[in-house]
Amino acid sequence: TQNKALPENVKYGIVLDAGSSHTSLYIYKWPAEKENDTGVVHQVEECRVKGPGISKFVQKVNEIGIYLTDCMERAREVIPRSQHQETPVYLGATAGMRLLRMESEELADRVLDVVERSLSNYPFDFQGARIITGQEEGAYGWITINYLLGKFSQKTRWFSIVPYETNNQETFGALDLGGASTQVTFVPQNQTIESPDNALQFRLYGKDYNVYTHSFLCYGKDQALWQKLAKDIQVASNEILRDPCFHPGYKKVVNVSDLYKTPCTKRFEMTLPFQQFEIQGIGNYQQCHQSILELFNTSYCPYSQCAFNGIFLPPLQGDFGAFSAFYFVMKFLNLTSEKVSQEKVTEMMKKFCAQPWEEIKTSYAGVKEKYLSEYCFSGTYILSLLLQGYHFTADSWEHIHFIGKIQGSDAGWTLGYMLNLTNMIPAEQPLSTPLSHSTYV
């Protein structure tokens, strides 16, 4: 008789990424009997929660439950009911909540408390909501991309399973850009990591990894823009800010109270003779770039070398996956191709930023104006951060791979977080066993 497949024995996991600008829910699935194998966990669903990040609910915590409903209901639909009770749910909050906690620990705790109560109402195995550290965010992003790229697998393959795969087991570095922070994580060349805060040691699948990581709080793209505006308004002669990072003809009124709301602008805060100012775009990449470079203090370094603001950064090594906003922004600008050189990216940014706002609105009619207006800044910021901040060069640009998904799973910290919390990355290489005879009958 013909073999008949048994019902699949699978497990699920849910991770909510509570970022500074929005929350996303990810559902992961894997074969139960292959938990310790590398590369078996994959993403089956992403649900973007409508609305801002959870830190914005500080004055309306009672709305958090409703905010999370749609995506949690979607998880209920996707995951078979029989699996609900054994499906773990984790929520990790990142830099938006780190900033809120800096302002008020009490307010941050209140938000998390309501989030926990809301998530506990679902039939899943809720495991808690917490603010993850910048170091964790960097480390889990690094684990995610290398897990998905098959870098932890000891088996040498004659075929390539992923487009970015090189023929060796050298890990990829991870470059993550969010709204409020940015992380850089990689294995440096046989070099000591001079600052203990930036050093991580992992043993994964029987191999030791000495990893460098740093998270730059306030250097996510949204907070960097607030920093730049706060810096530039200091020297404005009146309530008009002629800004090279916005398209010619673009106009927007900004409340000074909003500008100084974030801890990220505290260093630029001053008493201004107006409550509001108007941004008037002049669309000049070179000037925008120059203004952004002023956010990076490169004059002080207590180590053999630094990124910026006195933070140790070893010499760059190997290939890097650049994901999250690095990818979303560059994808919008059509600059993710491996063939696009740093020089070409700069040229394209010059042309893009110089395009009149009315023209841009017509060309991208389907894109929300709030996002559309900021691509010139964001693209220029990415170039500035990579070149000035992290010391990539025209030569090493080809080692940056802008990645959205790998094998259908989003690049980001959430998968690595779940793999760690469910103990699915063993320290030692699992013994290879023959296929279970119970797979088919």
Epitope: E170, Q189, N190, T298, S299, Q305, P315, L316, Q317, G318, D319, S341, E343, L387, Q388, H391, F392, T393, A394, D395, S396, E398, H399
Partner: antibody, heavy 118, light 110 residues
Framework: SVKEAGGRLVTPGGSLTLTCTVS????????ISWVRQAPGKGLEWIGI??????TYYANWAKGRFTISKTSSTTVDLKMTSLTTEDTAAYFC???????????????WGPGTLVTVSS | ALVMTQTPSSVSAAVGGTVTINCQAS??????LAWYQQKPGQRPQLLIY???TLASGVPSRFKGSASGTEYTLTISGVQCDDAATYYC????????????FGGGTEVVVT
């Protein structure tokens, strides 16, 4: 450390291969550059091979000079169609980083002399 | 093509004096600039990298600075041992260039 070898007298139009042997570090983690210096003149960059194997050359060196990794500890510089203008001390140098030369060259060989003359 | 213009080609200084050497990049090189010292018959030695970071074992009288695309090496309290030729080198872009090094500056100590 790095050390060059293979320099000698060659006739115009001839070819020559120089070898840079490294010790104490891995070529999978650092770039190696070739630089030359004609008698009484300044330093002239020829090209570089990065840890990935990617090579770059000075415009004037393209086509006539080839840099390649020949083993885990050696990098060769192959020179063809040599002229008297190519007479110089040839140095190999290690880049502080594996994927860029933005941090400079921190380890240089003593140089090997190539003389092109009939 | 990216060009490094180094000035002056030669400079003389008295012991204890100050020497300033400039290097102008034809485009932004994001502080990917190194300075080397070379004495006659010797190999070059790295002095400064990333425009202003002193290499290991280099005396603090050597100082590198940057302003836009202009880079400066300053030697304060010049000593006899500083008599050498100094070179700047950009490490930002290796494509479409003739030389990553500047032309060199000979420092004569009197």
């Amino acid at each position: 450390s790095v050390k060059e070898a293979g320099g000698r007298l060659v006739t115009p139009g001839g070819s020559l291969t120089l070898t840079c042997t490294v010790s104490g570090f891995s070529l999978s983690a650092y770039g190696i550059s070739w630089v030359r210096q004609a008698p009484g003149k300044g330093l002239e960059w020829i090209g570089i091979i990065y840890s990935s194997g990617r090579t770059y050359y000075a415009n004037w060196a393209k086509g006539r000079f080839t840099i390649s990794k020949t083993s885990s500890t050696t990098v060769d510089l192959k020179m063809t169609s040599l002229t008297t203008e190519d007479t110089a001390a040839y140095f190999c140098a290690r880049s502080r980083a594996g994927i860029s030369s933005g941090d400079g060259f921190d380890s240089w060989g003593p140089g090997t002399l190539v003389t092109v003359s009939s | 093509a990216l060009v490094m213009t180094q000035t002056p080609s030669s400079v003389s200084a008295a012991v204890g004096g100050t020497v300033t050497i400039n290097c102008q990049a034809s485009q932004n090189i994001y502080s990917n600039l190194a300075w080397y010292q070379q004495k006659p018959g010797q190999r070059p030695q790295l002095l400064i990298y990333r425009a202003s970071t002193l290499a290991s074992g280099v005396p603090s009288r050597f100082k590198g600075s940057a302003s836009g695309t202009e880079y400066t090496l300053t030697i304060s309290g010049v000593q006899c041992d500083d008599a050498a030729t100094y070179y700047c080198q950009q490490g930002f872009d290796s494509s479409n260039i003739d030389n990553t090094f500047g032309g060199g500056t000979e420092v004569v100590v009197t």
